[in-house]
Interface confidence: low
């Protein structure tokens, strides 16, 4: 089955610059299929823009200004690229790539879409680092004792733009866990968001990861925030002497990392 | 030019109660086109649900039914037993892929219908309230309550900032909520919740500490293994102290 990945969750540009949006095709040979690009402007219907067929033929929707959009494909990387020249306010939209995927039965086809890339146009000069800054919250003892479950909370602050995706996984598992999240909130010129995961008692002794996708993540890779295992009988940790206290005392350990 | 027009901009549905979305075609006979339905969820993911006839996306067959009303020139999508996962914007779209003559392989979309999911009417349930802390940050976790109306107060004399609560449907079909704030005296912050004309206070097993107990280990480059920031000898922390281990990465 064909699968489409748009690695850029968002693409922030200043006016008149060029935006290049990528779409990676897997499960199907890109040179044996057509790739379509659609855009969804705020408050408008999703509209077909341009396609590139298996033989390289480009088809543009009528009414689309010539020279505005360029579509290409690179078989070696199984990637289709939509280039938007001279970006302006009316180009603000979410751009989706898509392809027709044949079903097993005769004549049955469906069009599958990539997750979309949001094109953002800004005139702001932003701080050097506008990647999401994480803070983690571990389960309350009251919750683990009373409800035989624990909630992890992942707070992300001081990021720009507002487009962000958060999901949770157990360590050594690719299964995405069912989590909940708040709305993205504006704080001055940046944004914040939080997500939380409630796990049953039997999963508290596993390491959990809050995985964050954002345009400005360091090196362009997903940020992984590790939530250490919680032992429900006794918790053993491995800190340096100056981190430990007598076992009967309260230990409030706060780890800070400015390089996230 | 043809146009696909959803019957409603927003459709509130209750968990477990069947709901029907309709989308009419203007300017053409709907029978000349294939109708498709898609759902866009938070994060813009566009997921295929249904295409004429009887083609369903993975996981949609048991809970969705697509149909065409030729006489009324409209497409119908029925959600048989809505759950909180079904919240999102639903789009009808048409194409003529594989039809005779001048067929088109592009999709023509209608505007979306926003489906909001509410728990079905049920007995009132009071929340459980828990506090989670890290540095100046405090989160008040409010679990499994019904109905939705709630006031969450983080009680402190030294507020820096507070955020609007997030209220979501819980997997069991009630509500969960989280309210976040930043406080100079986070150790003394408690949470109280007004629900159904009653007040519920956070359940507190934690022993209070003052800020001199904060241990700040040296910074580490490795966000993936924060527990290794303090190098090696052992400390044993009993369960009662679990919440006091907070990490800012």
């Amino acid at each position: 089955a064909g699968h489409l990945e748009q690695p850029q969750i968002s693409s922030t540009k200043t006016l008149s610059k060029t935006a290049r949006l990528e779409c990676v095709v897997s499960g199907i040979t890109i040179s044996a299929t057509s790739v379509y690009w659609y855009r969804e402007r705020p408050g408008e219907v999703i509209q077909f823009l341009v396609s590139i067929s298996y033989d390289g033929t480009v088809r543009k929707e009528s009414g689309i200004p010539s020279g505005k959009f360029e579509v290409d494909r690179i078989p070696e990387t199984s990637t289709s690229t939509l280039t938007i020249h001279n970006v302006e306010k009316q180009d603000i939209a979410t751009y989706y790539c898509a392809l027709w995927e044949a079903q097993q039965e005769l004549g049955k086809k469906i069009k599958v879409f990539g997750p979309g890339t949001k094109l953002i146009i800004t005139d702001k000069q932003l701080d050097a680092d506008v990647s999401p800054k994480p803070t983690i919250f571990l389960p309350s003892i009251a919750e683990t004792k009373l409800q035989k479950a624990g909630t992890y909370l992942c707070l992300l602050e001081k990021f720009f733009p507002d487009v962000i995706k958060i999901h949770w996984q157990e360590k050594k598992s690719n299964t995405i866990l069912g989590s909940q999240e708040g709305n993205t909130m504006k704080t001055n010129d940046t944004y914040m968001k939080f997500s939380w995961l409630t796990v049953p008692e039997k999963s508290l002794d596993k390491e959990h990861r809050c995985i964050v996708r954002h345009e400005n993540n360091k090196n362009g890779v997903d940020q992984e925030i590790i939530f250490p295992p919680i032992k429900t009988d006794v918790i053993t940790m491995d800190p340096k002497d100056n981190c430990s206290k007598d076992a009967n005392d309260t230990l409030l350990l706060q780890l800070t990392n400015t390089s996230a | 030019a043809i146009e696909l027009v959803p019957e409603h901009q927003t459709v509130p549905v209750s968990i477990g109660v069947p709901a029907t979305l309709r989308c009419s075609m203007k300017g053409e006979a709907i029978g000349n086109y294939y109708i498709n339905w898609y759902r866009k969820t938070q994060g813009n993911t566009m997921t295929f649900i249904y295409r004429e006839k009887d083609i369903y996306g993975p996981g949609f067959k048991d809970n969705f039914q697509g149909d065409i009303d030729i006489a009324k020139n409209l497409a119908v999508l029925k959600i048989l037993a809505p759950s909180e996962r079904d919240e999102g914007s639903y789009y009808c779209a048409c194409d003529t892929l594989g039809m005779g003559g001048e067929y088109t392989d592009k999709l023509i979309f209608g505007k979306g219908t926003r489906v909001t999911v509410e728990p079905r009417s049920q007995p009132h349930t009071k929340p459980s309230v828990f506090v989670m802390k890290n540095g100046t940050n405090v989160a008040c976790l409010v679990k499994e309550f019904y109905p939705k109306d709630i006031r969450i107060n983080l009680v402190s004399s030294k507020k820096i900032t507070e955020f609007d609560p997030a209220i979501v449907i819980s997997p069991s079909g009630k509500y969960n909520a989280v309210k976040l704030g930043k406080y100079e005296d986070s150790n003394s912050v408690t949470c109280s919740v007004q629900h159904d004309n009653k007040t519920v206070h956070s359940t507190d097993f934690e022993v209070k500490t003052d800020s001199t107990d904060h241990v700040k280990p040296k910074e580490t480059e490795n966000t993936k293994q924060p527990s290794k920031s303090c190098h090696k000898p052992k400390a044993i922390v009993h369960t009662e102290k679990v919440n006091m281990m907070s990490l800012t990465v």
């Epitope: 005769l106 | 029978g31 006839k53 083609i55 030729i70």
Partner: antibody, heavy 118, light 110 residues
Framework: EVQLVESGGGLVQPGGSLRLSCAAS????????MNWVRQAPGKGLEWISY????????YYSDSVKGRFTVSRDNAKNSLYLQMNSLRDEDTAVYYC???????????WGRGTTVTVSS | QSALTQPASVSGSPGQSITISCTGT?????????VSWYQQHPGKAPKLMIY???NRPSGVSYRFSGSKSGNTASLTISGLQAEDEADYYC??????????FGGGTKLTVL
Amino acid sequence: EVQLVESGGGLVQPGGSLRLSCAASGFTFSTYGMNWVRQAPGKGLEWISYISTSSYTIYYSDSVKGRFTVSRDNAKNSLYLQMNSLRDEDTAVYYCAREGDWWYFDLWGRGTTVTVSS
Amino acid sequence: QSALTQPASVSGSPGQSITISCTGTSSDVGGYNYVSWYQQHPGKAPKLMIYEVSNRPSGVSYRFSGSKSGNTASLTISGLQAEDEADYYCSSYTSSSTLVFGGGTKLTVL
């Protein structure tokens, strides 16, 4: 092997009832709309009924509406046609047919013969 | 719903081309692109030859083609062969959510 096999035909008196079955094999039955088509001796094909995958949508031709009932059991990979109040003009070979996408039939059974006669 | 109109019979010599017409109304053939053609040999079940006006299922010879103009659909068989001798039926979806067949055309290869 991908196939449809009809059964249940036979001789029946006018006003009587009969239940036809169609067993599907070799493909995912639950993902296809199914139809019944009949052919009177020496005559042409006549479509009589359609049922969608989930049984949500059902259509009948005017000639059988109110007398015939189509149903399916996806767990058993089976299609059924309950025929009541049978008439002489219902005498025909009855075919079940799989719908390819939108009103075309890409797989047919070999048919079962129904004779209505006193 | 009355049947679509087809000629009762057509004939042609091997190697020739023949066309079978199928005439309906704006409520069926003219209104929708859901016209199919079936071939039926005596004592056998029908076989799909053309779907959605002009599409050929895999396994059907390229000699069979379909088209439509207004309320009339056509099946053309080029390079006629002996094994093409059979009955041919057209069908169309109708505005009353039913399917209607043509009366059938007997093709004789001379």
